[in-house]
Interface confidence: low
């Protein structure tokens, strides 16, 4: 039977709880078209979805936060879905002398948890 | 004009944006009364408040997330207020042989940002 309270699987149904999702964005979407040359389109992995009680808790603080949110909902917010790790991505920049490649370590999420 | 760097003043008014707040909790609130002896009451620093565009952005990913949320609000969630660092706290535990002190590095938030 369905659980209202998560164990390890999402109690809300597949794809509803905190997970990694790919979002397509153009350089124009990001406001980067004047200084980034490529890629013109980025596949950005982002963390989306709900954080029901105990689901993918990041650490002790997140477990406490979930518990206190249940007891003091107007005072303590529920945990939310944020990146737990990132994967590097290389962008080609315009520079005064031409172009350069730069690695961004904190741009694309690789994993998610509830914090 | 557009901000290149994360905003530090809250555009929603004092105390409304992502900040550290102290929440009192008893061991009973946390469900810890059977295995933690002291302190009986904890002052838990937690991250609360909203994350309007560019406010205390954690990193490049958070800046992008805020931007894409503005463009695709149903697809991309707004950044949310989570701990950026923690401060250690020592709890006194019951053990089979008596009591012991244990340090928790991830229980009490020390700083907050929007991720």
């Amino acid at each position: 039977s369905a659980h209202l309270h998560p164990r390890d699987s999402c109690p809300l149904g597949p794809g509803r709880c905190c997970h990694l999702e790919t979002v397509q964005a153009t350089l124009e979407d990001l406001g980067w078209s004047d200084w980034v040359l490529s890629p013109r389109q980025l596949q950005l992995s982002m963390c989306v979805g709900e954080c029901p009680h105990l689901y993918r808790s990041a650490n002790t603080h997140a477990l406490i936060k979930a518990r206190l949110h249940g007891l003091q909902p107007d005072r303590v917010p529920a945990p939310c879905c944020v990146p737990s790790s990132y994967t590097p991505v290389v962008l080609m920049h315009r520079t005064d002398s031409g172009v350069s490649l730069q690695t961004y370590d904190d741009l694309v999420a690789q994993g998610c948890h509830c914090a | 004009s557009a901000h290149l760097h994360p905003r530090d003043s809250c555009p929603l008014g004092p105390g409304r944006c992502c900040h550290l707040e102290t929440v009192q909790a008893t061991l009973e609130d946390l469900g810890w009364s059977d295995w933690v002896l002291s302190p009986r009451q904890l002052q838990l620093s937690m991250c609360v408040g909203e994350c309007p565009h560019l406010y205390r952005s954690a990193n490049t990913h958070a800046l992008i997330k805020a931007r894409l949320h503005g463009l695709q609000p149903d697809r991309v969630p707004a950044p949310c207020c989570v701990p950026s660092s923690y401060t250690p706290v020592v709890l006194m535990h019951r053990t089979d042989s008596g009591v012991s002190l244990q340090t928790y590095d991830d229980l009490v938030a020390q700083g907050c940002h929007c991720a």
């Epitope: 039977s1 659980h3 149904g13 979805g49 954080c51 249940g70 909902p73 529920a78 | 469900g31």
Partner: antibody, heavy 119, light 112 residues
Framework: QVQLQESGPGLVKPSQTLSLTCTVS??????????WTWIRQHPGKGLEWIGA???????VYNPSLKSRVTISVDTSKNQFSLKLSSVTAADTAVYYC???????????WGQGTLVTVSS | DIVMTQSPLSLPVTPGEPASISCRSS???????????LDWYLQKPGQSPQLLIY???NRASGVPDRFSGSGSGTDFTLKISRVEAEDVGVYYC?????????FGGGTKVEIK
Amino acid sequence: QVQLQESGPGLVKPSQTLSLTCTVSGGSINSGGYYWTWIRQHPGKGLEWIGAIYYSGSTVYNPSLKSRVTISVDTSKNQFSLKLSSVTAADTAVYYCARGVEYQHFNEWGQGTLVTVSS
Amino acid sequence: DIVMTQSPLSLPVTPGEPASISCRSSQSLLHSNGYNYLDWYLQKPGQSPQLLIYLGSNRASGVPDRFSGSGSGTDFTLKISRVEAEDVGVYYCMQTLEAPPTFGGGTKVEIK
């Protein structure tokens, strides 16, 4: 203090779709961690949980009604809605909307609206 | 679905006297996190239900301390230490451990 108010037709014909809306005031339906619920009470009887929706659109339904129920949320209007298709006289009830959190499941309720299914 | 059974069906009470309502579930409501997922509600005549007790024994905000909840696993009790006239209505227990949440049949409390 958040307030909830149900609205919709009080009379629905058999086989048609019952549609109700719950308007939330005094708080944002967008607030993470809350879920928004529909419960009904047949005349002179007990309470039956219909289903719930999180602000983002995640839903959980009562299996006994799942094939006929749709709950949706409109964050721009601060409202959530119930649609119950193929109604019969057995769906005549007072319908309540409520707000819940993890440990206090229905801590705020609307005043309820009576829906009668009759031709 | 988890079946919730309440007793008694009707409870005539005298103001100032204690009262007790029992609720039994068809399976344990004790979660591994130590909480019993059992709530109590009161529906006063002509009103919506209101939350009294959550997680078996926690009083909801604004609920007088004459109301208390106890029990664990499958057997739960709601006690009113000294009944007042405003306490009349139908009391429901409800489990929220598993979907769908289910309610007991209700106990009608009335003044003798």
